[in-house]
């Protein structure tokens, strides 16, 4: 059974992940540039189901394309370069989902824009955090 200290650590990591995802979303929403149109044409894969930490595998698999799409935006929209930002997210995701079991992510048939993709994972973080508090 998870201890209160491990639950607290998980909660803090999820809150960190949530803040990073919200920061990216805010950066995109405040972004006024012709490249935004191009960014919004990229289709991300969405998880068929995202209710447990192991489902973060679906996010991990989309982090590389997320970085490359974010690269289109000028870095001034984000506190960190996309490369560093995604690297930070990757570290948190790996810790949260664990590496004990190899979970094969299942994707939904519909793809999503970067905004829809980020909102989906923001909702996921908020949902898990609420079950921990």
């Amino acid at each position: 059974a998870p201890t209160s200290s491990s639950t607290k650590k998980t909660q803090l990591q999820l809150e960190h992940l949530l803040l990073d995802l919200q920061m990216i979303l805010n950066g995109i929403n405040n972004y006024k540039n012709p490249k935004l149109t191009r960014m919004l044409t990229f289709k991300f894969y969405m998880p068929k189901k995202a209710t447990e930490l192991k489902h973060l595998q679906c996010l991990e698999e989309e982090l590389k394309p997320l970085e490359e799409v974010l690269n289109l935006a000028q870095s001034k929209n984000f506190h960190l370069r996309p490369r560093d930002l995604i690297s930070n997210i990757n570290v948190i995701v790996l810790e949260l989902k664990g590496s004990e079991t190899t979970f094969m992510c299942e994707y939904a048939d519909e793809t999503a824009t970067i905004v829809e993709f980020l909102n989906r994972w923001i909702t996921f973080c908020q949902s898990i955090i609420s079950t921990l508090t």
């Epitope: 894969y45 394309p65 490359e68 289109l72």
Partner: antibody
């Protein structure tokens, strides 16, 4: 890390066929198309076509239509390119490279030299 | 097919020089253009995608610009490891087509 590892060099006679493989690792194989690009010795790069590993759908450059077949085996994350009716002009290094929408040819295989000689 | 005309076909430069390579498309390709570097006996390596976005890990001395039919790759200060052949690629329409290449040699 993302890797595309291709099969070894081949020597073929004119009129024969060659099948080159490209094994993907470090990412979900079905999320990215596999493209094939060739390069004759001392020449430029020539795009041959693409294959979607998820659906198996393909698109070939007109120049290779009818002679090239791109397939895959998703269970072993491997793509294949078969070129038939080989002629000496087909002597080249053949590369596989992945792409997804407008993120094109970001990782490449090491290349496979195909020599066509009688 | 969309023709990509690259110029010059070769150039000689010294370490520290600013180098500019141009690619002209036979029709409007919007921003569906990338730049690749190839060294002898090696696979090409992507430097820039969507005209001006730098591939992760590529030094910032490389930059791309342009739109429509005219595109440029610039190396702000040439380094010894930059001596190679550079190709542009359009992926706006099938078949995708490469420029004929620009060989950057040591002066």
């Amino acid at each position: 890390q993302v890797q595309l590892v291709q099969s070894g060099a081949e020597v073929k006679k004119p009129g024969a066929s060659v099948k080159v493989s490209c094994k993907a690792s470090g990412y979900r194989f079905t999320s990215y198309d596999i493209n094939w690009v060739r390069q004759a010795t001392g020449q430029g790069l020539e795009w041959m076509g693409w294959m979607n590993p998820n659906s198996g759908n393909t698109g070939y450059a007109q120049k290779f239509q009818g002679r090239v077949t791109m397939t895959r085996n998703t269970s072993i994350s491997t793509a294949y390119m078969e070129l038939s009716s080989l002629r000496s002009e087909d002597t080249a290094v053949y590369y596989c490279a992945r792409s997804r929408q407008w993120l094109v040819l970001d990782y490449w295989g090491q290349g496979t030299l195909v020599t066509v000689s009688s | 097919d969309i023709q990509m005309t690259q110029s010059p076909s070769s150039l000689s430069a010294s370490v520290g020089d600013r180098v500019t390579i141009t690619c002209r498309a036979s029709q409007d390709i919007r921003d569906d253009l990338g730049w690749y570097q190839q060294k002898p006996g090696k696979a090409p390596k992507r430097l820039i995608y969507v005209v001006s976005s730098l591939q992760s890990g590529v030094p910032s001395r490389f930059s791309g610009s342009g739109s429509g039919t005219e595109f440029t790759l610039t190396i702000s200060s040439l380094q010894p490891e930059d001596f190679a052949t550079y190709y542009c690629l359009q992926h706006n329409g099938y078949p995708w087509t490469f420029g004929q290449g620009t060989k950057v040699e040591i002066k």
